[in-house]
């Protein structure tokens, strides 16, 4: 058993429970954003394909003194499997582009709710 | 002590649209995630969907084109719409609570029956 | 979608009897499978939850065991309030899905 959704999660869970908390995590985030979040910081986009989640991780790691998306750093950590640190960079990251934090959360969202709905929760 | 309370029509016609309502009670419907089940004559249970506690929905994609559930936060409600119904969709109908980071029900509503017929 | 499959259908037992169901998943479920029970005309209750973790109130004459792809719901000496219909489900991934249920007569 893998305790899917990191340090979020109450212990072990099925992935698709995992997901789902994800995705409410990243709706919540979406739906109370008042100010710029994270006051507009930037972050490397991602290829949103095998792998993506330690991508996000890493891309999102990077961010600090940003209580808004410190949940979804935590929850993401579950579905990697090694252990990311700031600065660490995979393929997976388009290099050449940085978009806000806002726009990587809303780009992540649909995507994951697209995975969701197709039934890929692994 | 949370409770659950489904009502609506008993019938309805065919390619009609079935609309029913779960009141909830004790507990806020801004909390955990509602879901609609339902049990045709003879048939297993059948999961339809969700809506969270921010209002987001998954839907079973064998109902995908037929169903939307909603929510009225200042009546603690959810519904169910059931477009262009036929006789496949008599069922005994119910609303269930399934907390977050949970995957089983703990909270169901007695259920109603819906009969689809002209 | 994962297909859950109870047996038997039905089974006629006394008081004080041991009974057993088993529910079969058509994959690996791992240990995400729920039991619950429902009596005529009433909403259904759920009794465990994890393949073998009792329900809050849950008498411990039920328990559940199994993983992977089969599972078990024992009732170690049947009380005249278990005559009812039992379910399992999977939490495995959504949509989630039901067995046919397990009505459980008086001989």
């Known amino acids: 058993l893998t305790c899917l959704g990191g340090f979020a999660s109450p212990g072990p869970v099925p992935p698709s429970t995992a997901l789902r908390e994800l995705i409410e995590e990243l709706v919540n985030i979406t739906q109370n954003q008042k100010a710029p979040l994270c006051n507009g910081s930037m972050v490397w986009s991602i290829n949103l394909t095998a792998g993506m989640y330690c991508a996000a991780l890493e891309s999102l790691i990077n961010v600090s003194g940003c209580s808004a998306i410190e949940k979804t750093q935590r929850m993401l950590s579950g579905f990697c499997p090694h252990k990311v640190s700031a600065g660490q960079f995979s393929s997976l990251h388009v290099r050449d582009t940085k978009i806000e934090v806002a726009q990587f959360v809303k780009d992540l969202l649909l995507h994951l709710k697209k995975l969701f709905r197709e039934g890929q929760f692994n | 002590e949370v409770q659950l309370q489904e009502s609506g029509p008993g019938l309805v016609k065919p390619s009609e649209t079935l609309s029913l309502t779960c009141t909830v009670s004790?507990?806020?419907?801004?909390?955990?995630?509602w879901n609609w089940i339902r049990k045709p004559p003879g048939k297993k249970l059948e999961y339809m969907g969700y809506?969270?506690?921010?209002?987001?929905?998954y839907y079973n994609p064998s109902l995908k084109s037929q169903i939307t559930i909603s929510r009225d936060t200042s009546k603690n409600q959810l519904s169910l719409k059931l477009s262009s119904v036929t006789a496949a969709d008599t069922a005994v109908y119910y609303c269930?609570?399934?907390?977050?980071?949970?995957?089983?029900?703990?909270?169901w509503g007695q259920g109603t029956t819906v009969t689809v017929s002209s | 979608d994962i297909q859950m499959t109870q047996s038997p259908s039905s089974l006629s037992a006394s008081v004080g009897d041991r009974v057993t169901i088993t529910c079969h998943a058509s994959?690996?479920?791992?240990?995400?499978l729920s039991w619950y029970q429902q009596k005529p005309g009433k909403a259904p209750k759920l009794l465990i939850y994890?393949?073998?973790d009792l329900h809050t109130g849950v008498p411990s004459r039920f328990s559940g065991s199994g993983s992977g792809t089969d599972f078990t719901l024992t009732i170690s000496s049947l009380q005249p309030e278990d005559f009812a219909t039992y379910y399992c489900?999977?939490?495995?991934?959504?949509?989630?899905?039901f067995g046919g249920g397990t009505k459980v007569e008086i001989k």
């Open positions: 994959q690996n479920i791992n240990v995400w």
């Open positions: 809506i969270s506690y921010n209002g987001n929905t």
């Open positions: 994890k393949a073998s």
């Open positions: 489900q999977q939490g495995q991934s959504y949509p989630y899905t």
């Open positions: 269930a609570r399934l907390a977050k980071w949970t995957w089983y029900f703990d909270i």
């Open positions: 004790g507990g806020s419907i801004t909390s955990d995630y």
